[in-house]
């Protein structure tokens, strides 16, 4: 699944949490809450697709309650009365317990899966496209809530236009209730058209024989550092790469580095002894030339925390720090299929990584 | 190329442990949910546990609540399912199965398409 | 536990002949439905996912389709190489979450 025209994630949100949906709800898209159940306070947490922040009209009110054995409600609220309650009487969450959260929207039905099984399906009893906000409550924490469209990348390499004019940049770190839309790349005064050459193929025997290669997301926070992990598929245009971590107290530099083979592709590595953010290109051990310039103040803090959203496009990776967009840098490896390896080390607790 | 390679099967006497390994290359375990699928001699399929791992979530079939445990390791990309207090019915061979669940196309999409090539377990005095 | 009930158990058929396995679900499972074609001492291997969709590298002459709660898995044209034992699987979210069809074994008339 292609990020192209995606909304970027809502980080570590504060929970009562209700958030915008850009062009609301679309048939195909699939929205994903990842978190933890509380294990101390409160019996229940609520996801709710609604119409506007006031709570009155809520399409779907997906509604875990560790109550009596533990079952899930969902439910549709017009105009401030409820309807009919729809219970599901298996609970796939556990208290203490992380989560992953999934939710389809399809023209007859929301579908939800929870850690990777399909759970409950439920038919509209409203139109969808009057959602415009999903909110969260209850006893919960919330690591991210992240946003998939549903374009993907076609099958056989091809020459197609993509707009790259929606945002594609993290939002704003979250202050309060209500989480205001996520930036945009800076763009040229009009709106971006690319054409992107698609190269990607899946392997011999892939289950899905589409390059569009599903986000894959790692568990917190068992991250062992130096932490390697594959990028399925490699990098193609519309590729997004998703990190958050905290810089040790007493950090002197760490990297990420996109590999390819014994090439690193793109080495990313900030320094603090330095006050730098360095970029680089290794080639067969030789390093190219440097990158260093900045539009602004180092990004990176010791003891903060940071996100770093890598956004591949045909020419270039863009790199925005904490939702601002910081620098492009233009390929030197230009195979991006061959790009599969993510390497991150160094001074840094890395808190979430999405490939 | 992805794989999964099951072992630590063999011959163990009833109310005896075993721990079974899947060692999966070409994936992350931490980004699909692995399960366990038995087929005991001249029988069908018997969905035994799953783990997804990038949560830590867990299920078993009922016949093996409480005997068995299924657990991830993810820096070494490997599964495991111990298996206690083990009966005669457990006989089988074991395979563990990468299943799939994502979105392509405006749908979901859902089956196990990689599977190790098995291991067997034999419960017998 | 949501039940998938497979039939029949065996038939036996000739090469070319057009043959259809059936499941039914105990209640909805949605299209989390695959199917599965299994050779003696071999590990299953997925043939359709998602109730109708073609796995990789499947031949098209193996087809899926979803009725309300039952599903079939059709082969067209049957070759020498489909002679084998074949399962329905649901994902549906239950006290067990997976759950397989008994098997349909394809015999040589």
């Known amino acids: 699944m292609a990020f192209s025209g995606s909304q970027a994630p809502y980080l570590s949100p504060a929970v009562p949490f209700s958030g915008t949906i850009q062009g609301g709800l679309q048939d195909g898209l699939q929205i994903t809450v990842n978190g933890t159940v509380l294990s101390s306070s409160g019996t229940r947490f609520a996801v709710n697709f609604q119409t506007g922040f006031s709570g009155n009209d809520i399409a779907f009110h997906f509604n875990p309650r560790f109550e009596d054995g533990g079952y899930v409600v969902c439910n549709t609220r017009q105009n401030g009365s409820w309807g009919p309650e729809e219970r599901k009487t298996h609970m796939p969450f556990q208290k203490g317990m992380p989560f992953d959260l999934c939710f389809l929207v399809q023209s007859s039905d929301f579908k939800v899966m929870v850690n990777g099984i399909l759970f409950v399906q439920y038919f509209h009893r409203v139109p969808f496209h009057r959602v415009d906000t999903i909110s969260v409550n209850g006893s919960v924490q919330l690591s991210y809530i992240s946003f998939q469209n549903p374009r993907t990348v076609p099958v056989q390499p091809a020459f197609s236009t993509v707009p790259f004019s929606q945002p594609v940049c993290f939002p704003p770190r979250p202050r309060g209730r209500r989480q205001k839309p996520p930036g945009v790349w800076p763009a040229n005064p009009a709106p971006i058209t690319q054409t992107v050459i698609h190269t990607v193929q899946s392997a011999p025997g892939q289950m899905f024989s589409t390059p569009a290669i599903p986000p894959m997301m790692y568990p917190h926070p068992a991250y062992p550092m130096p932490f390697i992990t594959t990028i399925l598929g490699g990098l193609y245009p519309s590729k997004s790469i998703l990190l958050s971590g905290t810089v040790l107290p007493s950090a002197q530099r760490f990297h990420i580095n996109l590999c390819s083979g014994n090439h690193i592709a793109f080495h990313l590595n900030p320094r603090f002894d330095e006050n730098a953010v360095v970029r680089n290109t290794q080639i067969d051990n030789s390093w190219g030339s440097e990158e260093r310039s900045l539009p602004r103040k180092m990004p990176f803090v010791r003891g903060q925390s940071f996100s770093v959203w890598i956004l591949c496009e045909a020419h270039c990776l863009k790199v925005a720090v904490d939702g601002q967009h910081l620098f492009e840098y233009y390929h030197r490896l230009r195979n991006l299929p061959t790009i599969n390896r993510l390497e991150v080390g160094g001074d840094i607790q890395l808190t979430h990584v999405q490939t | 190329e992805v794989q999964l390679v099951e072992s630590g099967g063999g011959l163990v006497q009833p109310g005896g442990s075993l721990r079974l390994s899947c060692a999966a290359s070409?994936?992350?375990?931490?980004?699909?949910?692995i399960h366990w699928v038995r087929q005991a001699p001249g029988k069908g399929l018997e969905w035994v546990a799953y783990i997804y791992p990038y949560s830590g979530y867990t299920s078993y079939a009922d016949s093996v609540k409480g005997r068995f445990t299924i657990s991830a390791d993810t820096s070494k990309n490997t599964a495991y399912l111990q298996m206690n207090s083990l009966r005669a019915e457990d006989t089988a061979v074991y395979y563990c199965a990468r299943y799939s669940t994502y979105s392509s196309s405006s749908k979901w999409v859902w089956g196990m398409d990689y599977w190790g090539q098995g291991t067997l377990v034999t419960v017998s005095s | 536990d949501i039940q998938m009930t497979q039939s029949p158990s065996s038939l036996s058929a000739s090469v070319g002949d057009r043959v259809t396995i059936t499941c039914r679900a105990s209640?909805?499972?949605?299209?989390?439905v695959a199917w599965y074609q299994q050779k003696p001492g071999k590990a299953p291997k997925l043939l359709i996912y998602s109730a109708s969709s073609l796995y990789s590298g499947v031949p098209s002459r193996f087809s899926g389709s979803r009725s309300g709660t039952d599903f079939t898995l059709t082969i067209s044209s049957l070759q020498p190489e489909d002679f084998a034992t074949y399962y329905c699987?649901?994902?549906?979210?239950?006290?067990?979450?997976?759950?397989f069809g008994q098997g349909t074994k394809v015999e040589i008339k």
């Open positions: 209640q909805s499972v949605s299209s989390a």
């Open positions: 070409g994936f992350t375990v931490s980004s699909s949910s």
């Open positions: 699987q649901q994902s549906y979210y239950d006290s067990n979450p997976i759950t």
